[in-house]
């Protein structure tokens, strides 16, 4: 069964900067990745970025840079312009659309006690939505 993992990492140097890492574990080719926060895409969440393997990416504030790390994983840098970061208690979700498996989505957040530079373990919290 394909799985999606999500890691949320606070940057050690800047407490207002976060990076979300997501990856797809499974066969098939990825056709699209959608990163959202506040909940799953299309279920109360707000899109932060869309990444297409050939056409490029599209991102919205407060996302700063979305990029492919490997053929099956992406990273999204976030920057909070406010005094206190809203990201600490936020859920980030990544949805991978792949052929022929369909869509797989998982969510993750920064552990409450995490120190700068530490990240959430890459355990998928699967939302079993195989569209």
């Amino acid at each position: 069964t394909p799985e999606v993992w999500v890691q949320v990492q606070m940057e050690a140097t800047e407490l207002s900067s976060f990076t979300v890492h997501c990856g797809f574990l499974g066969p098939g080719s990825i056709s699209l990745v959608t990163v959202s926060w506040g909940g799953p895409d299309g279920a109360g969440g707000t899109k932060l970025a869309v990444l297409h393997p050939e056409l490029g990416t599209r991102q919205w504030a407060p996302a700063r840079q979305a990029r492919w790390e490997t053929q099956s994983s992406i990273s999204l840098a976030l920057e909070d312009s406010g005094a206190s970061s809203p990201f600490a208690n936020t859920t980030f979700c990544c949805k991978f659309a792949s052929f022929p498996e369909g869509s797989w989505e998982s969510c993750g957040s920064l552990p409450p006690s995490s120190d700068p530079g530490l990240s959430a373990p890459p355990t998928p919290v699967p939302i079993l939505r195989a569209d």
Epitope: G42, T46, H52, L55, G56
Partner: antibody
Framework: DVQLVESGGGLVKPGGSLKLSCAAS????????MYWVRQTPEKRLEWVAT????????YYPDNVKGRFTISRDTAKNNLYLQMSHLKSEDTAMYYC???????????WGQGTLVTVSA | DIVMTQSHKFMSTSVGDRVSITCKAS??????VAWFQQKPGQSPKLLIY???TRHTGVPDRFTGSGSGTDFTLTISNVQSEDLADYFC?????????FGGGTKLEIK
């Protein structure tokens, strides 16, 4: 077919208010970021407002911040732009737009004209 | 704010020719640039995004290039229906900004 139809434009005095509407059809309205872009009589294009897919977040350029409010009614598939404290420099054709996947401002309505004049 | 400058307000060309419309950003915008075409009496239409990706249905005579601060829209084998205003736009950072436009005239 994607359709965006703006309405609500007209002549308004400086300091007045106006609410623009955009009726959307042919796509999943709730899953898309939506935007208002305007074009001045000199043909200059200006981004005016953004609303996120979940309607939780809105963004504006400084020249309209505090005067304009973008909102959406997902049940009616409508996008709105409430404009207040209007100035003569707000005179423009106002367009409702949306993205397609990663392509910005991929679809535009036909526009609605707002004229601010005494 | 990032200023997008289209130095040529007007450009004149003939059917069958090749023309290049340029756009300069006041600071680095990577490749987050789009090009729009607006024919007389119509709404703008997306031609190119990510500096060089053609939008669906756009003829391959339209080509976008550039990165950083300098961008070009090239129309090869110009057709009479290409008579229009052309605008560049950056979406690298808020506020998203447009160039002032270049009007393409057909001789």
């Amino acid at each position: 077919d994607v359709q965006l139809v703006e309405s609500g434009g007209g002549l308004v005095k400086p300091g007045g208010s106006l609410k623009l509407s955009c009726a959307a059809s042919g796509f999943s309205f709730s899953e898309n970021y939506m935007y208002w872009v305007r074009q001045t009589p000199e043909k200059r294009l200006e981004w005016v407002a953004t609303i996120s897919d979940g309607a939780s977040y809105t963004y504006y350029p400084d020249n309209v911040k505090g005067r304009f409010t973008i909102s959406r009614d997902t049940a009616k598939n409508n996008l709105y732009l409430q404009m207040s404290h209007l100035k003569s420099e707000d005179t423009a054709m106002y367009y409702c737009t949306r993205d397609e996947l990663i392509a910005p401002f991929a679809y535009w309505g036909q526009g609605t004209l707002v004229t601010v004049s005494a | 704010d990032i200023v997008m400058t289209q130095s040529h307000k007007f450009m004149s060309t003939s059917v069958g020719d090749r023309v290049s419309i340029t756009c300069k950003a006041s600071q680095d915008v990577g490749t987050a640039v789009a090009w729009f075409q607006q024919k007389p009496g119509q709404s703008p239409k997306l031609l190119i995004y990510w500096a060089s990706t053609r939008h669906t249905g756009v003829p391959d005579r339209f080509t976008g290039s550039g990165s950083g601060t300098d961008f070009t829209l090239t129309i090869s084998n110009v057709q009479s229906e290409d008579l229009a205003d052309y605008f560049c736009q950056q979406y690298n950072s808020y506020p998203w900004t447009f160039g002032g436009g270049t009007k393409l005239e057909i001789k």
